[in-house]
């Protein structure tokens, strides 16, 4: 397969990854699909340095990341281990709050206005960040 050696147009390169910052909102699943159709994934934050980079670009706006617990435990969309990985939750979060009246709890994580994380209803139309790694071999399926 081919390798991606530079970032696509309108994407920002940082530490061997490419990032795309939306300027409109979508529900978490629709944002996830958008990134996947760009051969990318919702951003996976693995360090304080990456957290600051993303925070700088999104500003004080609720923004989806690639972290959810829709199937039970918290999981990063790219398989990065949640338990041992970087975390930046707001105090007393995640709380899986049911009091919003929208049905169910809160299963999707987002950056809040101060950059720290909160869990929220996945249907909320927040902005999002896509990420893809440079030099990642294409996963083109074989033609039948």
């Amino acid at each position: 397969g081919s390798e991606r050696t530079c970032c696509p147009v309108n994407w920002v390169e940082h530490e061997r990854s490419c990032y795309w910052f939306s300027r409109s909102g979508k529900a978490w699943a629709d944002a996830d699909n958008y990134c996947r159709l760009e051969d990318a994934h919702l951003v996976v934050v693995t360090s304080w340095e990456e957290q600051k980079f993303v925070q700088h670009h999104i500003g004080p706006v609720n923004t989806w990341m690639g972290l959810h617990d829709q199937n039970g435990p918290w999981k990063w969309v790219d398989g990065t281990d949640y338990e041992t990985g970087f975390k930046n939750w707001r105090p007393e979060q995640p709380d899986d709050w049911y009091g919003h009246g929208l049905g169910g709890g809160e299963d999707c994580a987002h950056f809040t206005d101060d950059g720290r994380w909160n869990d929220d209803v996945c249907q909320r139309p927040y902005r999002w960040v896509c990420e893809t790694e440079l030099d990642k071999a294409s996963q083109e399926p074989p033609l039948l």
Epitope: S24, E38, D39
Partner: antibody, heavy 120, light 107 residues
Framework: EVQLLESGGGLVQPGGSLRLSCAAS????????MSWVRQTPGQGLEWVSA????????FYADSVKGRFTISRDNSKNTLYLQMNSLRAEDTAVYYC?????????????WGQGTLVTVSS | DIQMTQSPSSVSASVGDRVTFTCRAS??????LAWYQQKPGTAPKLLIY???SLQSGVPSRFSGSGSGTNFTLTVSGLQPEDFATYYC?????????FGQGTKVEIK
């Protein structure tokens, strides 16, 4: 100049198969998601399937899921749609469409279309 | 699935007229909307994306507005080449869906 040229349409019996192709030129093919959209005679437009630029992700309309397969060969700048278990309601003009510059979801270029007729 | 409803289904107009078409989504799609023009025997052509952004090369007499569930496409000063069918499309959520179209006919 961006060009998309579909081929492979024709008359097929119900239950049969057909493979559509779309030859692309005039842009960096592997950088763009592509879709198939169909239009039934005298009717509106229906999105059928989409595939990411490097082929790693595909999406389908429920009406074709499990029967149709979208794929691409970036070395040949070609998009494909393998259509199996065809039904009369699949009769339509099939267009390949390129996703817009700098982001997916809107189609900024379309091919001329290829007619698929499913009839006994 | 998100349903897209266009009105009217057809409109009769004259060259020079200002015409407005409406597209309504069954749920909030914010600005994830495009407008296409299609003439008989040809493929659709993108006119407007992101609800109000004019596609490169499209004449400025075409304009789009709206957000949420209600959108409009306006042609200010209809030209002979504008007699066609116009479709809206939502790109908020899969499956992407189109309206049934508005046909503009010569009065």
């Amino acid at each position: 100049e961006v060009q998309l040229l579909e081929s492979g349409g024709g008359l097929v019996q119900p239950g049969g198969s057909l493979r559509l192709s779309c030859a692309a030129s005039g842009f960096t093919f592997s950088s763009y998601a592509m879709s198939w959209v169909r239009q039934t005679p005298g009717q509106g437009l229906e999105w059928v399937s989409a595939i990411s630029g490097r082929g790693g992700t595909t999406f389908y309309a429920d009406s074709v899921k499990g029967r149709f397969t979208i794929s691409r060969d970036n070395s040949k700048n070609t998009l494909y749609l393998q259509m199996n278990s065809l039904r009369a309601e699949d009769t339509a003009v099939y267009y390949c469409a390129k996703d817009g510059y700098g982001g997916n979801s809107f189609f900024d270029y379309w091919g001329q279309g290829t007619l698929v007729t499913v009839s006994s | 699935d998100i349903q897209m409803t266009q009105s009217p289904s057809s409109v009769s107009a004259s060259v020079g007229d200002r015409v407005t078409f409406t597209c309504r989504a069954s749920q909030d799609i914010f600005d994830w909307l495009a407008w296409y023009q299609q003439k008989p025997g040809t493929a659709p052509k993108l006119l407007i994306y992101a609800a109000s952004s004019l596609q490169s090369g499209v004449p400025s007499r075409f304009s789009g507005s709206g957000s949420g569930t209600n959108f409009t496409l306006t042609v200010s000063g209809l030209q002979p080449e504008d007699f066609a069918t116009y479709y809206c499309q939502q790109a908020y959520s899969f499956p992407w869906t189109f309206g049934q179209g508005t046909k503009v006919e010569i009065k």
